[in-house]
């Protein structure tokens, strides 16, 4: 990037520890409950650095053997947490993400908690519920959304530069007027992407131009005055 | 078919006691939790308690904790309720309801045993 | 203890019009996302039927003009259109956690 920036504007979210509850809306439920062996699964995004619960179907202690959730993370080996009523005893397998906890004893809340979610946790959580007659499951596939990095610059005559960086998923760049653009995508190893869009107006009454970067954690909008070319007449509005 | 079968009407004495019973077929007995609810003549629903035949849990309401007495038969799939020192408040409807797993619900309900407490 | 307050206590609705039951919650009646409320059917004589089960699910085999709405501490039971087989008395439930408790019922007649 070039060091005669002549105008930077930045936006980067401040994120405070919100809590997102991935506990399925009773609306959502498609499925008919009256028989065991009953399953859904929901995709969930949630943005990086909040605290997420996850719950497990609407079963009741007194109705249950075993809650397992199973933990699959990539590149990790599967992660269970399991509680067996009857001896009162929790038991964990392969977890080693400190963060990723039950809420409170299983015997009183059967939910999972991540407290401030990384990009780690992106994976798919299930609960199981054994019962006598059967096993009920709730799945989710976790996406950790990451807000990017927002900054618009100019670089060089009447051309633009509008940078969405490090994002997950990747940012959408749109500009208004439209001009002559060009976009490059770049991946990181830790499954952000950086979206950068380049743009020239040759029309020179357009003085003032907008980034408008379009993500899942929100939406923003820069906008710069285009410096204009020296010795160029400016054509009347 | 689930089927929930109750005993027939009782007509019985203040003071004394009444047991009645709930005979479910058409599924696995310990397998689900047995609820008893009571209906007054004219009135609404109230909760009474319930038994889980697979380890015999059982839980009242507060109210109902000195009057039922909750049991259960493993071997004739069938919950009893006795209801004890009987008064004129005590002649309702009594009915039994099996608890679904999803959502606590009761899907399938006894057809109810009338209680009438009269000297 | 959540106490369901239900309202009206009565109402006359026309054949083939929509009739609206509410209940009340004395407390939200939501635990891990879920609205334990419940809504049955009682006519004389015979024991409450399951209608709704957690605030808006149709039971199997209830016809779909019974629907259920609500969250938190207010929830909705509408039925439209009404038929003549559906003058009954209404109950909302609670079963989230002990005591369960039921609301006071609605009688619904057609007129």
């Known amino acids: 990037q070039p060091n005669n920036s002549l105008m930077l504007q930045t936006s980067k979210e401040n994120h405070a520890l919100a809590s997102s509850s991935l506990c399925m809306d009773e609306k959502q439920i498609t499925q008919n409950y009256s028989k065991v062996l009953a399953e859904v699964n929901t995709s969930w995004p949630v943005k990086m650095a909040t605290n997420a619960v996850l719950c497990c179907p609407p079963i009741a202690l007194r109705n249950l053997i075993i809650i397992t959730w199973e933990i699959i993370l990539r590149g990790q080996p599967s992660c269970t947490k399991a509680y067996k009523k009857e001896t009162n005893e929790t038991k964990e397998t392969n977890c080693t993400d400190e963060r990723i906890t039950w809420v409170s004893r299983p015997d009183q809340n059967s939910d999972l908690q991540i407290r401030t979610v990384a990009i780690t946790h992106d994976g798919y959580y299930r609960c199981i519920m054994v019962t006598p007659d059967g096993n009920f499951h709730r799945g989710y596939h976790l996406q950790v959304l990451v807000t990017p990095e927002v900054t618009l610059f100019q670089n060089r005559n009447r051309t633009a530069v509008c940078k969405a960086v490090a994002g997950k998923p990747a940012a959408h760049i749109s500009w208004i007027p439209e001009g002559d653009c060009a976009t490059k995508q770049e991946y990181w190893s830790n499954g952000t992407v950086t979206v950068k869009s380049t743009c020239h107006w040759e029309v020179h009454n357009v003085s003032t131009v907008t980034c408008h970067v379009s993500h899942l954690t929100g939406n923003k909008s820069l906008y710069i005055e285009l410096l204009p070319v020296p010795g160029a007449k400016k054509s009347a509005k | 078919e689930v089927q929930l079968q109750q005993s027939g009407p009782e007509l019985v004495k203040p003071g004394a006691s009444v047991k009645m019973s709930c005979k479910a077929s058409?599924?696995?007995?310990?397998?689900?939790?047995m609820h008893w609810v009571k209906q007054k003549p004219g009135q609404g629903l109230e909760w009474i308690g319930y038994i889980h035949p697979y380890n015999d849990d059982i839980k009242h309401n507060e109210k109902f904790k000195d009057k039922a007495t909750l049991t259960s038969a493993k071997s004739s799939s069938t919950v009893y309720m006795e209801l004890s020192s009987l008064t004129s408040e005590d002649s309702a409807v009594y009915y039994c309801?099996?608890?679904?797993?999803?959502?606590?619900?009761?899907?399938?309900w006894g057809q109810g045993t009338l209680v009438t407490v009269s000297a | 203890d959540i106490v369901l307050t239900q309202s009206p206590a009565s109402l006359a609705v026309s054949l083939g019009q929509r009739a609206t039951i509410s209940c009340r919650a004395s407390k939200s009646v939501r635990t891990s996302g879920y609205s334990y409320l419940h809504w049955y059917q009682q006519k004389p004589g015979q024991p409450p039927k399951l209608l709704i089960y957690?605030?808006?699910n149709l039971e199997s085999g209830v016809p779909a003009r019974f629907s259920g709405s609500g969250s938190g501490t207010d929830f909705t039971l509408n039925i439209h259109p009404v038929e003549e087989e559906d003058a009954a008395t209404y109950y909302c439930?609670?079963?989230?956690?002990?005591?369960?408790?039921f609301g006071g019922g609605t009688k619904l007649e057609i007129k």
């Open positions: 309801a099996r608890e679904e797993y999803y959502g606590s619900r009761f899907a399938y």
């Open positions: 439930q609670y079963s989230g956690e002990l005591p369960f408790t």
């Open positions: 957690l605030a808006s």
């Open positions: 058409g599924y696995t007995f310990t397998s689900y939790v």
